[in-house]
């Protein structure tokens, strides 16, 4: 399901609970891609020794993955909210195609990692409603996402493996870091 | 074995500069969320503050444009500068590991302490 | 800013009694609460995260509870190990916050 469990409508009936914010459905949205992000990591943990290697270890790769930076706005220091409501959904959207590569990448888990894709579609549905200054987000290019799939897809089985636990970890650090910024808009 | 070690602490004067360590052994530090944590003799514990995966601090209001949290992962060790250091600060300072595997900050591995005195 | 408030701050209790500590939050953090344990001169240990699930190796006498704002820890049958200081931190957002900690609750000997 791409939203959380409480956000169908029979559960918003209910008269008992006062319907979310829109900060609140944002929040529990990346709450639950975030617990997808889990599951999926560790099968990927079990699975190889990556998970234990360092950042050093790993940093060696070609791609080029959304990363917050203080310049985004996100940060304590220097916090802007229109700037880095931007770059979270610039993001996200640059995300969308190593979400789409890593549909297959998962025996056991491949629910979850759909799962994982279509929540992320919605969270971006929910900011955009939020941001003011949508001229300012760039939307990745379809022919060079297309490429950079194929090529994905082309690597050898280990950087197979390696794209993946590089992708869920660098998502992951994207997601915590946005529901930090988010928390103090 | 998996431990935290700190270390630099001292006696230091007001308006004075101190430099903490924190070393890391069985894990490696940049895989990991790392904290702060002090506490004032007879006191309770202070959140000092945070470094995160990407180089993202945060700090508690008593720290901001005081101290800077940083690593250094080719040694596996987190750094605390303090500067302008007051009474007030004095305190065991406390290097802790956050689990980092979800959202919530809690803290599952802490060091010994190092015990920083600021007075003249 | 999220503040963190802690009662009763000292508490006497003999061994076999059944303790509760509570912590409240000034504004809602969800589930993300934790509990530590403190004994003098040395570390705390994590006891408890997400408000109820127990950090490993933790005795089953120790639970927790709450959501939103109130926060519970009990102890169900107190013993000689659990005299110590109990502090709650929260989680949630530790931006524009003077102390991510609750005050603490001392558990003495009654």
């Known amino acids: 399901a791409p939203v959380p469990p409480g956000e169908d409508s029979k559960d918003v009936a209910a008269p008992h609970r006062q319907p979310l914010t829109s900060s609140e459905r944002i929040d529990k949205q990346i709450r639950y891609i975030l617990d997808g992000i889990s599951a999926l990591r560790k099968e990927t943990c079990n699975k190889s020794n990556m998970c234990e290697s360092s950042k050093e270890a790993l940093a060696e790769n070609n791609l080029n993955l959304p990363k917050m930076a203080e310049k985004d706005g996100c940060f304590q220091s220097g916090f802007n909210e229109e700037t880095c409501l931007v770059k979270i959904i610039t993001g996200l959207l640059e995300f969308e195609v190593y979400l789409e590569y890593l549909q297959n990448r998962f025996e056991s888990s491949e629910e979850q990692a759909r799962a994982v894709q279509m929540s992320t579609k919605v969270l971006i549905q929910f900011l955009q409603k939020k941001a003011k200054n949508l001229d300012a987000i760039t939307t990745p290019d379809p022919t060079t996402n297309a490429s950079l799939l194929t090529k994905l897809q082309a690597q050898n089985q280990w950087l197979q493996d390696m794209t993946t636990h590089l992708i869920l970890r660098s998502f992951k650090e994207f997601l915590q870091s946005s529901l930090r910024a988010l928390r103090q808009m | 074995e998996v431990q935290l070690v700190e270390s630099g602490g001292g006696l230091v004067q007001p308006g004075g500069s101190l430099r903490l360590s924190c070393a890391a052994s069985?894990?490696?530090?940049?895989?990991?969320?790392m904290t702060w944590v002090r506490q004032a003799p007879g006191k309770g514990l202070e959140w000092v503050g945070m470094?995160?995966?990407?180089?993202?601090?945060a700090y508690a209001n008593s720290a901001i444009g005081r101290f800077t949290i940083s690593r250094d992962n080719s040694k596996n060790t987190l750094y605390l500068q303090m500067n302008s250091l007051r009474a007030e600060d004095t305190a065991v300072y406390y290097c802790?590991?956050?689990?980092?595997?979800?959202?919530?900050?809690?803290?599952?591995?802490w060091g010994q302490g190092t015990l920083v005195t600021v007075s003249s | 800013d999220i503040q963190m408030t802690q009662s009763p701050s000292t508490l006497s209790a003999s061994v076999g009694d059944r303790v509760t500590i509570t912590c409240q939050a000034s504004?809602?953090?969800?589930?993300?609460l934790s509990w530590y344990q403190q004994k003098p001169g040395k570390a705390p240990k994590l006891l408890i995260y997400?408000?109820?699930t127990l950090a490993s190796g933790v005795p089953s006498r120790f639970s927790g509870s709450g959501s939103g704002t109130e926060f519970t820890l009990t102890i169900s049958s107190l013993q000689p190990d659990d005299f110590a200081t109990y502090y709650c931190?929260?989680?949630?957002?530790?931006?524009?916050?003077?102390?991510?900690f609750g005050g603490g609750t001392k558990v003495e000997i009654k």
């Open positions: 931190q929260q989680g949630y957002s530790l931006r524009n916050i003077d102390n991510a």
């Open positions: 997400r408000a109820s």
């Open positions: 069985g894990f490696s530090l940049s895989n990991y969320y």
């Open positions: 504004q809602s953090i969800n589930n993300e």
């Open positions: 802790a590991r956050d689990d980092s595997s979800d959202w919530d900050a809690k803290f599952n591995l």
């Open positions: 470094i995160y995966g990407s180089d993202e601090t």
